[in-house]
């Protein structure tokens, strides 16, 4: 675990150009705040780190769908 506690992030000023394997991802949040410079998706990894990604990229959309399916299956 990190040595100090994180607070929720608000904006992505840049996005990653590397594809993150789906098995490393735990959840995601859409960033649509009008005050942020760009629309983005923030993935949370199983390690607890956050990754800014471009929702226009195919791997990002596929990862979001996959995580949606996982959460849907968890619902009673």
């Amino acid at each position: 675990q990190p040595d100090s506690v994180s607070i929720p992030i608000t904006c992505c000023f840049n996005v990653i150009n590397r594809k993150i394997p789906i098995q490393r991802l735990e959840s995601y949040t859409r960033i649509t705040n009008i005050q942020c410079p760009k629309e983005a998706v923030i993935f949370k990894t199983k390690r607890g780190k956050e990754v800014c990604a471009d929702p226009k990229e195919r791997w990002v959309r596929d990862s979001m769908k996959h995580l949606d399916q996982i959460f849907q299956n968890l619902k009673p």
């Epitope: 994180s6 840049n14 990653i16 590397r18 993150i20 390690r47 780190k49 956050e50």
Partner: antibody, heavy 119, light 107 residues
Framework: QVQLQESGPGLVKPSQTLSLTCTVS??????????WNWIRQHPGKGLEWIGY???????YYNPSLKSRITISIDTSKNQFSLTLSSVTAADTAVYYC???????????WGQGTMVTVSS | DIQMTQSPSSLSASVGDRVTITCQAS??????LNWYQQKPGKAPKLLIY???NLETGVPSRFSGSGSGTDFTFTINSLQPEDIATYYC?????????FGQGTKLEIK
């Protein structure tokens, strides 16, 4: 294009505290998803990861150095810093700052700054 | 901590040769491995991530493979500008650890 630049004293006396700063240009240190790291390389040797800080202040330190290091961030100056206390000759190294985009790959590095510990 | 063992520690090869470097982890790290190139007096540069994915802008003569504990880094046709030291880095566990490096020279 984000660039990193280390700065600090090139010579530190044994038992003193080493302080280094990394200035981020071409982008905001406050961006989500960026983890700001310190890595060092002893002369003629391999690389040793020291620790990281997130813009929120969240840190993780290498346990081998944890008792002696502090990594801090100043978002107003677009800088993050390393302090290493009680230095010895074994802390003589090139110190690099580097960014990872949350996926644990160091994709942007500073050019490195050589720090010698000597009386 | 996970120990990363690279071999060989140094090697000499001719322009056009196929060069292979290996990295062995002390425990299973899946494919959580990166490769870096460090030229003399310069900072390391990311070449390969997730064991086999080429970083943007890196020439296709570089490649990586492997999973678990055994990994391979290959330069398909060695070029003079490839003179450097190459490092593997695992990220399965924190703290991150690097191999000791492989110094590549041209014959």
């Amino acid at each position: 294009q984000v660039q990193l630049q280390e700065s600090g004293p090139g010579l530190v006396k044994p038992s003193q505290t080493l302080s280094l700063t990394c200035t981020v240009s071409g982008g905001s240190i406050s961006s989500g998803g960026n983890y700001w790291n310190w890595i060092r390389q002893h002369p003629g040797k391999g690389l040793e990861w020291i620790g990281y800080i997130y813009y929120s202040g969240n840190t993780y330190y290498n346990p081998s150095l944890k008792s002696r290091i502090t990594i801090s961030i100043d978002t107003s100056k677009n800088q993050f810093s390393l302090t290493l206390s009680s230095v010895t000759a074994a802390d003589t190294a090139v110190y690099y700052c580097a960014r990872d985009g949350g996926d644990d790959a160091f994709d942007i590095w500073g050019q490195g700054t050589m720090v010698t510990v000597s009386s | 901590d996970i120990q990363m063992t690279q071999s060989p520690s140094s090697l000499s090869a001719s322009v056009g040769d196929r060069v292979t470097i290996t990295c062995q982890a002390s425990q299973d790290i899946s494919n959580y491995l990166n490769w870096y190139q460090q030229k003399p007096g310069k900072a390391p540069k990311l070449l390969i991530y997730d064991a086999s994915n080429l970083e943007t802008g890196v020439p296709s003569r570089f490649s990586g493979s492997g999973s678990g504990t055994d990994f391979t880094f290959t330069i398909n046709s060695l070029q003079p500008e490839d003179i450097a030291t190459y490092y593997c880095q695992e990220y399965n566990n924190l703290p991150y650890s690097f191999g000791q490096g492989t110094k590549l020279e041209i014959k």
